[in-house]
């Protein structure tokens, strides 16, 4: 995947939380759930109460304001979705508060949020060719595309 060293001079400043307590469902209608303390996975649920609820925080880039850059936090926790490398599971990283400024290697906390119709894509800022993805019998990970599923539906007002 692309190195993120070229991004080291870009500073991302926290704006505000723009979404609270939403659920992410993949294209197979599987919801993201907690696998354990560190990882997420996806499963078809009858009861959406078991799904992870996320908050989304928006950041402004010092480079360009036209792109929507976000952080994903598990609601009512201090756990943030953190990118690793291609085909590696995303980690849940605990931080005492939402970072006010993000730069350099910390961009693994950030994702470009793109919507197209009902499809939502989260591209890693640290690895710009890779998306948050679900994969059969695997954790939620970073992937470039099929066979992993990279498009999600946002279900709101689930609280």
């Amino acid at each position: 995947s692309a190195p993120f060293s070229f991004l080291s001079n870009v500073k991302y400043n926290f704006m505000r939380i723009i979404k609270y307590e939403f659920i992410l469902n993949d294209a197979l209608n599987q919801s993201i759930i907690r696998a354990n303390d560190q990882y997420l996975t996806a499963a078809a649920l009858h009861n959406l109460d078991e799904a992870v609820k996320f908050d989304m925080g928006a950041y402004k880039s010092s480079k360009d304001d036209a792109k929507i850059t976000v952080i994903l936090r598990i609601s009512k926790t201090q756990l943030y979705v953190t990118a690793q490398d291609e085909d590696q599971p995303v980690l849940l990283k605990e931080m005492p508060e939402i970072p006010k400024t993000i730069t350099g290697s910390e961009t693994n906390l950030l994702f470009f949020w793109e919507t197209h119709g009902t499809k939502n894509y989260f591209t890693s800022v640290a690895h710009p060719n890779l998306f948050i993805a679900t994969k059969q019998d695997y954790w939620v990970c970073l992937a470039g595309g099929p066979p992993s599923i990279t498009d999600f539906q946002i279900l709101e007002n689930q609280a």
Epitope: L7, S61, A66, F112, E114, T115, H116, G117, I154
Partner: antibody, heavy 118, light 113 residues
């Protein structure tokens, strides 16, 4: 799938204002940018301005900065475009479009013809 | 503002033949941070609103026939209709959404020869 339904044609006098509405059925504007684009008779497409409701941010083309107002209602289902100090050269079809959080149009309204004539 | 220049202004192509429309931006619309080209292509028929064909320069919108394809990067882009059909007669526009204000090309009218 979101469908956009715009208000009907308007005939206006120079110097007056027009307010065009754009109602989303089958969805809301929550995750989307909304664009307003116009097309003068026989001409191409011109972006007037837009709004990303989730950020409460509006953006206007320089030429319309002083006389364009773009808003969205609280339910996030209807967008409005108001153009003031109308002149004959504002005669055009006005379109709203949405469907992405970038400024391109996946879903388009049917268009509203605004005629400015004394 | 980014200026979008389309060529040709009009194009007459025989049924079943290839139609190629070019679009040039006055500055790059490739965003290095996510390797995406912020460029869309639309088709507009008389009396109708534009219809999205291609976004991110090369991603075909759902339901758009696969004879339509988009290519290019940076400042030079192409919309190709591999085998022109009668229903493809329309005006085609490119649009950049890299920076504000989003801007459109002047349009290319495609007709049947």
């Amino acid at each position: 799938q979101v469908q956009l339904v715009q208000s009907g044609a308007e005939v206006k006098k120079p110097g007056s204002s027009v307010k065009v509405s754009c109602k989303a059925s089958g969805g809301r504007f929550t995750n989307y940018a909304i664009l307003w684009v116009r097309q003068a008779p026989g001409q191409g497409l011109q972006w007037l301005g837009g709004i990303i409701p989730i950020f409460d941010e509006t953006d206007h083309a320089q030429d319309f900065q002083d006389r364009l107002t773009i808003t969205v209602d609280e339910s996030m289902t209807t967008a409005y475009m108001e153009l003031s100090s109308l002149r004959p050269e504002d005669t055009a079809i006005y379109y709203c479009a949405t469907g992405s959080n970038s400024y391109y149009g996946l879903y388009w309204g049917q268009g509203t013809l605004v005629t400015v004539s004394s | 503002d980014i200026v979008m220049t389309q060529s040709p202004d009009s194009l007459a192509v025989s049924l079943g033949e290839r139609a190629t429309i070019n679009c040039k931006s006055s500055q790059s619309v490739l965003y290095s941070s996510n390797n995406k080209n912020y460029l869309a292509w639309y088709q507009q028929k008389p009396g109708q609103p534009p219809k999205l064909l291609i976004y991110w320069a090369s991603t075909r919108e759902s339901g758009v026939p696969d004879r339509f394809s988009g290519s290019g990067s940076g400042t030079d882009f192409t919309l190709t209709i591999s085998s022109l059909q009668a229903e493809d007669v329309a005006v085609y526009y490119c649009q950049q959404y890299y920076s504000s204000p989003p801007t459109f090309g002047g349009g290319t009218k495609v007709e049947i020869k």
